[in-house]
């Protein structure tokens, strides 16, 4: 179980690196973030560490109310602050693992 979670964490972070470069990856991550109401791997600040992402933005899928451009110059109160690895991991533990 721990190995699966560790793999999921590494994979999620790898996909984050590809987010700005790959539309397919972006759409998968957007779906996960929107569906699980989460943002980033550990939390939303992970997006700040992606070199090709603008420092003041997160994907729009992180927003509580998703609209085009809502992740630009974001306010913390307007986005999901919980990380996706923990949130999706909890769902996986409960339903799959």
């Amino acid at each position: 179980r721990d190995k699966v979670m560790s793999e999921f964490n590494n994979n999620f972070r790898q996909q984050m690196e590809n987010y700005p470069k790959n539309n397919h990856t972006a759409s998968i991550l957007d779906r996960m973030q929107a569906d699980f109401k989460c943002c980033g791997a550990a939390n939303y600040t992970d997006w700040e560490k992606i070199p090709s992402m603008s420092k003041n933005r997160v994907p729009d899928s992180c927003c509580i109310n998703v609209t085009v451009g809502c992740g630009i110059n974001f306010n913390e109160k307007a986005i999901h602050k919980e990380g996706c690895v923990e949130k999706i991991g909890g769902w996986l533990r409960k339903n799959v693992l």
Epitope: N43, K55, N56, G69, C70, N73, N75, K77, A78
Partner: antibody, heavy 119, light 108 residues
Amino acid sequence: QVQLVESGGGLVKPGGSLRLSCAASGFIFTDYFMNWIRQAPGKGLEWVSYISNSGNILYYADSVKGRFTISRDNAKASLYLQMSSLKAEDTAVYYCVRDPRMFYGMDVWGQGTTVTVSS
Amino acid sequence: DIQMTQSPSSLSASVGDRVTITCRASQSISSYLNWYQQKPGKAPKLLIYAASSLQSGVPSRFSGSGSGTDFTLTISSLQPEDFATYYCQQSYSTPPITFGQGTRLEIK
């Protein structure tokens, strides 16, 4: 009413330190990013630093990086700017500024506090 | 970093005149453009946000337009209290938050 009140400015020698404070009232402090913006005598506005709602994200202008530290105490609804290794070019009025972020502008400014760096 | 360039840097006008100040961004900033007014010895005051939205309490003679790289602030009929310095500011790509150099509006 919504208010930001700065304090802590004064005259300091080059190389010295100073700590600016900003007391917020009349609004939910944790709903906002906060900025320090300065204005040198007779000059335009220059952004210095910002800090996110929770304090998780903070950034600095290149001109102050490594010398200034921004922080906030949400329990006290207060913003701070610790300034060290001060230079003559840091002489300015320093404004504490509320920032709703997204596409909204910086909507509430303090009255400013004057920092003079001179020997 | 995104540079903001205002023109003119100073402007003389009379009460009742229609005045336009322009601001140009070095790259597209969508509509993430704000305008501020500053009077001598006072803190700046937000006039316009999101390029064209009037901040609460600001008189309707002030208006903003533009998107992408080119923006304008228009004062339809100058009043004595409008003589001040005006700044544009972008919030599309930060840090850093960048301002124009300012436009000083003086009485002719």
